[in-house]
Amino acid sequence: IPTEIPTSALVKETLALLSTHRTLLIANETLRIPVPVHKNHQLCTEEIFQGIGTLESQTVQGGTVERLFKNLSLIKKYIDGQKKKCGEERRAVNQFLDYLQEFLGVMNTEWIIES
Amino acid sequence: IPTEIPTSALVKETLALLSTHRTLLIANETLRIPVPVHKNHQLCTEEIFQGIGTLESQTVQGGTVERLFKNLSLIKKYIDGQKKKCGEERRAVNQFLDYLQEFLGVMNTEWIIES
């Protein structure tokens, strides 16, 4: 798979492959994988990809199921790149405060917060 | 501050305190704090709170600015709790795939993805 494929297209394709290979993936009925309790997905990327690793090691490879796991590893690579961009740029306090305000505003409006 | 205050109310109050104390917070003109380049905020919580720690250590404490940092530490506590919930529950593959599908769906529609 060329890594030049836009991430958005990669995600769409991966969703389709996930549906296609569902039956094969659920073949192992005894397997247990951590599943986050909440829907703040970005907080859980590490655990999600650990789960994908567990699933891959238990799945018979071959054909387009390999493409599914290859795609998932490219998505992980993209997310790791985004995580790197969290701390690379040291800026003035002014900018940090504007970002913090944005972060809290997003928490206030978009996060799924339990009371 | 009672930790029983709902997180959503805590976030709102913190936003207000942030505006109130802006002038005091930007007093240190030489201070540099990492600011994420993108807007996928949840990926960057660790760096954001490290930045808050840096800012707190450089800010003259007293009055309601202390309340601001106390609030921020309670928000961090809430997020840490959410992160713990990422990996606590081990579920069947079916449930994991449902969550993975939801995660990719959210990535597809809500994440800020650079082309």
Epitope: A92, Q95, G105 | T30, K39
Partner: antibody, heavy 119, light 107 residues
């Protein structure tokens, strides 16, 4: 492709207000801040302020605070810069420019809008 | 506010010449500086960001260097299309400020 298209030239009388628009296309509008910069005839560039379409938060150069108002309409992916109490020295070309990332360089510029203030 | 002092304010050069423009910040701006080109009657165009990072599509004859307070834009071999005014911009802190510009003219 990514584009910022600005509204046409305006002629205003001193004391009046002007509202310049900047329509974004080719990218997700809320992902990038929009900055406003002006250039008086034969002069250099001057930063007016920025608006974050993600949360409607705006920040101004102190010189323009109280006179400039930055807004966005997310439904049409359009940013606006309104300048009130116009005086002759506000005659300038006004540009909108997109931040590449949070508080980063301006990677895309609008074509500019000439605002002439004359009695 | 951070002052950006650019020099020279204008220069005359010939095609093929190596041209250097400098920009000095009144305080440390790390490397948060970009170089902008503007041709008469046209919108500005950013050439370099973060002091030395060339933007995609910009010819490699343009290069930037410096950090802290002193920065340089170099055009290694001036081309006819490079005759324009060049500005530095600090985006380290608010308000963002520009240098006063350097006009590059044909000798």
């Amino acid at each position: 492709q990514v584009q910022l298209v600005q509204s046409g030239a305006e002629v205003k009388k001193p004391g009046a207000s002007v509202k310049v628009s900047c329509k974004a296309s080719g990218y997700t509008f809320t992902n990038h801040h929009i900055n406003w910069v002006r250039q008086a005839p034969g002069q250099g560039l001057e930063w007016i302020g920025y608006i974050n379409p993600y949360n409607d938060y705006s920040r101004y150069n102190q010189k323009f605070k109280g006179r400039a108002t930055l807004t966005v309409d997310k439904s049409t992916s359009t940013a606006y810069m309104e300048l009130s109490s116009l005086r002759s020295e506000d005659t300038a070309v006004y540009y909108c420019a997109r931040d590449y990332g949070n508080f980063w360089y301006f990677d895309v510029w609008g074509q500019g809008t000439l605002v002439t203030v004359s009695s | 506010d951070i002052q950006m002092t650019q020099s020279p304010s204008s220069l005359s050069a010939s095609v093929g010449d190596r041209v250097t423009i400098t920009c000095k910040a009144s305080q440390d701006i790390n490397s948060y500086l970009s170089w902008i080109q503007q041709k008469p009657g046209k919108a500005p165009k950013t050439l370099i960001h973060r002091a030395d990072r060339l933007i995609d599509g910009v010819p490699s004859r343009f290069s930037g260097s410096g950090s802290g307070q002193d920065f340089t834009l170099t055009i290694s071999s001036l081309q006819p299309e490079d005759f324009a005014t060049y500005y530095c911009l600090q985006y380290d802190d608010f308000p963002y400020t520009f240098g006063q510009g350097t006009k590059v003219e044909i000798k």
